[in-house]
């Protein structure tokens, strides 16, 4: 029986009946064994076939077998109901070997020419399986010449059998207080040959509750307990399971904060698996009762470990833990069933005693000493000498703990001194130098510091004066001795003030004329305003109408009198304003340099002389009565004049204050 070619020789060739293409002889038996490499199969087809036809091919036949299986028994020329001829059919070995047997019996009724066949080895596509057969690979099958290999989807690993995909389903840890876990691919069939471990690990104090949901289908056995696939649940206290079959297991209250779930599958079966919904519980904390004037958030039926609540107080109340106010409060439930912080109180907001108002007072409207939420107080200024600036003085204790005005301001109102009040009434006639009476010139300030000079009080902590009067002290403000509230220059009874800073107009040049002869002194403390100490007003925009030529102003001071000495008592003089051109002309002739009188000056005095300010009056105010407001304002500052005070044809020259209002306002607001 000749053998076909052996692998690794090329596996292809021709087979023919003995004597082909001639007729074959009787009593012939020929056997060919063809072998292909592993992973290959043999393909065979006939190009000629002419054998004696007999019932079930009992006489002459060609038999094809692969291993123990007969693939075909062939005879005749064409197939009948009971006999088969190859025709155009191609035959394939089941494995890598093919046996071909030719036999003829003892006689033929007529000559038959036999057969001719061709064969070749070809790759087996192991990945293609017949319908109903198990797939070659669990997931992915990859064919190649001479063989195949399997691979797995992500999350799986190829089993050592090289065909099954085992799930990578271990090491998952669930730490949330509730969640879901299921068999791999649920609700599709779970993978074979897998061992899954899931852990639920909650904080100590929690207890895990397991509920099987939807469906449960794990391969089982009618007699043996879960021999194939099974689910086990392990805690530090006990083991539950194994579970298999189609019945949903009952709820498991583990009484443990850690649970391990193990799921093991074998190599067979087609089951959908399981799904677990887990929750947790813990020892509940006492139900939080909100304090009076407060509420709890969030509101829950119960509060267990890690649950929290906050307390919010009603408007006008604040949180108080013991005796310490809190901005916020949150308590957390602990594993022993107690809250981590005691319940706070909601205490009514207290704005505290209102600040004292300088030169004013405060009155409790709601009740004596009541300073809590919505309490009302009323600030007022000391009558006559002070007036309230900014608001009406009514303040309410608001929820933020601040006393707040009706305009929403949290700062105190301001009691501003009333300016320009004088006990003196003016007449139309011009009088000679006269002694001032108490309250006539309450703005008058005596400045001592090297020389005697004067100034006028502005507000309650500024003094307006002439630059030349304080020039020497500009860098040593503390050297200025400032006195007010007295008529007698040498009296020991006066109000003392000290200078904090001296501001000389930047346009003033010492010893080079008197243009911009103006200065401000900031006092280091506010002075108390009364009938003897009252500020002078600054001129309004409309003030020019009270300072026309021949309008009368009043100058006051302790300067030289006709006797040539400084006055002991404060003196004053009423003098008219002089036409500016007339004044300019008076100081055009020697010994005065041209341009001595500038637009920043005004002149006052009598052409005949005799009424004037003099040395020692420098810096004092030339004041005018505003007949509309009935208040006195400063129109001029005693600056300079003729060498001989009160000289006929010469006039007193004063700094024109209205030209300096922006400068004054800027200094005062900046400092």
């Amino acid at each position: 029986t000749p053998l076909g070619p052996k692998w690794p020789e090329p596996v292809f060739g021709r087979l023919a009946s003995p004597g082909f293409p001639g007729e074959y002889a009787n009593d012939q038996e020929r056997r060919w064994t063809l072998t292909a490499p592993p992973g290959y199969r043999l393909r065979l087809y006939f190009t000629h076939f002419d054998l004696e036809l007999s019932h079930l091919c009992e006489y002459d036949f060609v038999k094809l077998s692969s291993g123990a299986k007969v693939l075909a028994t062939l005879c005749g020329q064409e197939s009948t109901d009971t006999e088969r001829a190859p025709g155009k059919d191609t035959f394939y070995s089941l494995g890598s070997s093919l046996d071909i047997t030719f036999r003829s019996d003892y006689s033929n009724e007529k000559p038959f020419t036999g057969f001719e066949a061709f064969y070749a080895a070809e790759d087996i596509d192991e990945c293609q399986v017949a319908p109903g057969e198990a797939p070659t690979c669990d997931h992915h099958c990859h064919n190649h010449l001479g063989g195949f290999y399997c691979s797995c989807r992500a999350g799986y690993v190829l089993h050592r059998n090289k065909r099954t995909c085992s799930a990578l389903c271990s090491g998952q840890v669930f730490t949330q207080r509730s969640g879901e876990l299921s068999s791999p691919e649920y609700p599709r069939p779970y993978p074979k040959l897998s061992s899954c471990t899931y852990s639920i690990s909650l904080e100590e104090g929690f207890s895990v509750i397991l509920d099987f949901v939807e469906s449960f289908d794990v391969e089982t056995h009618p007699e043996t307990l879960c021999p194939y696939d099974f689910l086990k649940i392990q805690t530090d206290r006990e083991e539950h399971g194994p579970f298999c079959g189609k019945t949903l297991p009952h709820r498991i209250e583990t009484k443990s904060n850690t649970v391990t779930i193990t799921f093991v599958t074998d190599e067979s079966g087609d089951h959908t698996g399981w799904k677990i919904h887990y929750t947790s519980t813990a020892q509940p904390c006492p139900y939080p009762m909100a304090p009076p004037n407060g509420h709890v958030s969030p509101v829950q039926a119960k509060y267990i470990l890690k649950d929290s609540f906050s307390i919010f107080c009603e408007t006008g109340y604040e949180l108080l833990q013991g005796h310490l106010p809190l901005k916020s409060f949150t308590a957390v439930c602990q594993k022993d069933g107690s809250w981590d912080r005691p319940m706070p109180a909601c205490s009514i907001v207290d704005c505290g005693p209102p600040d004292d108002l300088p030169s004013g007072r405060v009155e409790y409207i709601t009740g004596p000493g009541v300073t809590t939420y919505k309490a009302v107080i009323q600030y007022s200024c000391e009558e006559t000498f002070y007036t309230m600036k900014v608001n009406d003085g009514k303040y309410v204790c608001e929820a933020d703990g601040f006393w707040t005005s009706s305009k929403g301001e949290k700062s105190l109102p301001v009691c501003e001194p009333v300016c320009g009040l004088s006990a003196r009434t003016t007449g139309g006639r011009i009088y000679g130098g006269q002694k001032a009476k108490p309250g006539d010139f309450p703005w008058q300030v005596l400045i001592l510091g090297g020389t005697t000079a004067a100034g006028a009080l502005l507000y309650d902590n500024w003094v307006l004066t002439a630059a030349h009067a304080v020039y020497e002290q500009k860098h040593d403000a503390s050297a200025l001795d400032i006195r007010m509230g007295t008529l007698k220059r040498l009296s020991p009874h006066y109000t003392q003030a000290w200078s904090e800073a001296v501001f000389i107009h930047e346009g003033y040049t010492h010893d080079a004329g008197f243009d911009n002869d103006i200065a401000l002194i900031k006092l280091n403390n506010k002075v108390v305003i009364n009938s003897n100490i009252t500020p002078i007003c600054l001129p309004r925009k409309e003030a020019e109408s009270f300072m026309r030529t021949d309008d009368i102003g009043t100058a006051s001071g302790w300067g030289l009198t006709q006797r040539g000495f400084l006055a002991r008592n404060l003196m004053y003089v009423d003098i008219p304003i002089v036409d500016h051109q007339k004044c300019t002309a008076a100081y055009e002739k020697p010994p005065y340099p041209r341009g001595s009188v500038t637009a920043n000056m005004l002149c006052a005095g009598l052409e005949s002389g005799g009424k004037d300010s003099c040395r020692g009056d420098s810096g004092g105010a030339l004041v005018f009565l505003d007949s509309e407001t009935e208040r006195w304002f400063v129109g001029g500052i005693v600056s300079w004049g003729s060498m001989n005070c009160g000289e006929a044809g010469q006039y007193g020259v004063y700094t024109k204050v209205i030209n300096y209002i922006p400068w004054i306002e800027n200094i005062i607001s900046d400092f």
Partner: antibody, heavy 121, light 105 residues
Framework: QVTLKESGPVLVKPTETLTLTCTVS??????????VSWIRQPPGKALEWLAH???????SYSTSLKSRLTISKDTSKSQVVLTMTNMDPVDTATYYC?????????????WGQGTTVTVSS | YVLTQPPSVSASPGQTASITCSGD??????VSWYQQKPGRSPVLVIY???KRPSGIPERFSGSNYGNTATLTISGTQAVDEADYYC?????????FGGGTKVTVL
């Protein structure tokens, strides 16, 4: 006018117990909205809070010194007493008492002038 | 609980000096500030983050957000040269910062 005045020994030996008294005036120790704190300051160093007591006898102590401190009050005498056991040279400091209030959210609005305590053998 | 302050801050007269105080979630607590001059007792200058006690000049102001509280001295003057301490309460215990020395140049 609210004032607080500390008194106690100037010199203490190591291992001894220090007793300091704070005498208050201008407010009452029974005032529900006020309390008294003790604070100390070693030479050239920062302030360190020690303890406080409120009108209802609510007390609190510094965690690091709790085992050594005791605070108490005698409302009738307007006095708050602090005792500190097992004194050590590192406890050398100026010891202050101060008033605290709900109004100031525990801010200490009036302080005593302080008493200097030296711990040395 | 720890409150952290810079050791020193300097400012020229008239300028603004800002002192910070940082601590975990400090904005959730009320902060007080104290001024202490050499050889003197501390003086409360700010309480409840922003409030000024009576008699404290308006140039002192406070704020407190997030993890940082700030004491601001606007228009610093020579008299403001001192040590400044922040203070808060944590679980009923008082805590002071390490202090900041303010120097007026």
């Amino acid at each position: 006018q609210v004032t607080l005045k500390e008194s106690g020994p100037v010199l203490v030996k190591p291992t001894e117990t220090l007793t300091l008294t704070c005498t208050v005036s201008g407010f009452s120790l029974s005032n529900a909205r006020m309390g008294v704190s003790w604070i100390r300051q070693p030479p050239g160093k920062a302030l360190e809070w020690l303890a406080h007591i409120f009108s209802n006898d609510e007390k609190s102590y510094s965690t690091s010194l709790k085992s050594r401190l005791t605070i108490s009050k005698d409302t009738s005498k307007s006095q708050v007493v602090l005792t500190m056991t097992n004194m050590d040279p590192v406890d050398t400091a100026t010891y202050y008492c101060a008033r605290m209030a709900i109004l100031t959210a525990g801010g200490m609005d009036v302080w005593g002038q302080g008493t200097t305590v030296t711990v040395s053998s | 609980y720890v409150l952290t302050q810079p050791p020193s801050v300097s400012a020229s007269p008239g300028q603004t000096a800002s002192i910070t105080c940082s601590g975990d979630k400090l904005g959730d607590k009320y902060v007080s500030w104290y001024q202490q001059k050499p050889g003197r007792s501390p003086v409360l200058v700010i309480y409840r983050d922003t409030k000024r006690p009576s008699g404290i000049p308006e140039r002192f102001s406070g704020s407190n957000y997030g993890n940082t509280a700030t004491l601001t001295i606007s228009g610093t003057q020579a008299v403001d040269e001192a040590d400044y301490y922040c203070q808060a309460w944590d679980s009923g215990s008082g805590v002071f910062g390490g202090g900041t020395k303010v120097t007026v140049l």
